[in-house]
């Protein structure tokens, strides 16, 4: 199977990897942040 | 036609940083992936890194972290690699390859006194 | 790192023989988007290497069917079914599933 000249990127997912890794990362902060103001209105 | 043009051979001294550039056309540059590979002793292949045009968004093999650092231009569709401070470890061929697939044809950096 | 074993080193071979050349990974390849990024290129002398399959088994635009790629996991053969002048070189196996991307130290097909 031939692949067409340019679809072809054999490390794209790569990228993509990274991309998602610091979402999530972004995200845990994010809910330690939320985490640490409920804390404080709490109090 | 995809085509990645290399900059030219540099005789450089230790010590010294210089940037090697990769002007690609047949496709539209900002859709894939920049590879960068180091070629020494005429065989021994060590990927560099990659850099997505689009995004600026980088990958390094951290054995080069703070010895290589790719951008891009996105005007005139060119990926650099600049390669700092310089040694006889870092004499080798140097290619960008897009999406890992389509290779330049290799820039020979070399290092002396 | 994932190391990449490949094996022969050296393959010498005579024109119309078929080739066989095997690449071993440290660590299994399989993408955990169920790809498995393993490629061969091909280097010969004084060019840039060219890239002749993709993901095990995918022959690259242009590449002949002589050529033939197979495997899974940690375990890859790279098949040239009868060898033409134009095949010698160095044949590289390399993986783009895990960072760093990494490649086998080369296998030279010369004639015998």
């Known amino acids: 199977s031939e692949e067409p000249p340019i679809s072809l990127d054999l490390t794209f997912h790569l990228l993509r990897e990274v991309l998602e890794m610091a979402r999530a990362e972004q995200l845990a902060q994010q809910a330690h942040s939320n985490r640490k103001l409920m804390e404080i209105i709490g109090k | 036609e995809v085509q990645l043009q290399q900059s030219g051979p540099e005789l450089v001294k230790p010590g010294v940083s210089m940037k090697i550039s990769c002007k690609a056309s047949?496709?539209?540059?900002?859709?894939?992936?920049m590879n960068w590979v180091k070629q020494s002793h005429g065989k021994n292949l060590e990927w560099i890194g990659l850099?997505?045009?689009?995004?600026?968004?980088?990958i390094y093999n951290q054995k080069f972290k703070g010895k290589a650092t790719l951008t891009v231009h996105k005007s005139s569709s060119t990926a650099y690699m600049e390669l700092l401070s310089l040694t006889s470890e870092d004499s080798a061929v140097y290619y960008c390859?897009?999406?890992?697939?389509?290779w330049g044809q290799g820039t020979l950096v070399t290092v002396s006194a | 790192d994932v190391v990449m074993t490949q094996t022969p080193l050296s393959l010498p071979v005579s024109l119309g023989d078929q080739a066989s050349i095997s690449c071993r990974s440290s660590q299994s390849l399989l993408h955990s988007n169920g790809n498995t990024y393993l490629h061969w290129y091909l280097q010969k002398p004084g060019q840039s290497p060219e890239l002749l399959i993709y993901?095990?088994?995918n022959r690259f635009s242009g590449v002949p069917d002589r050529f033939s790629g197979s495997g899974s996991g940690t375990d890859f053969t790279l098949k040239i079914s009868r060898v033409e002048a134009e095949d010698l070189g160095v044949y590289f196996c390399?993986?783009?599933?895990?960072?760093?991307?990494?490649f086998g130290a080369g296998t030279k097909l010369e004639l015998k």
């Open positions: 850099i997505h045009p689009d995004n600026g968004g980088t």
């Open positions: 390399s993986q783009s599933t895990h960072v760093p991307l990494t």
């Open positions: 993901k095990v088994s």
């Open positions: 390859a897009n999406g890992f697939a389509y």
């Open positions: 047949g496709y539209s540059f900002t859709d894939s992936t």
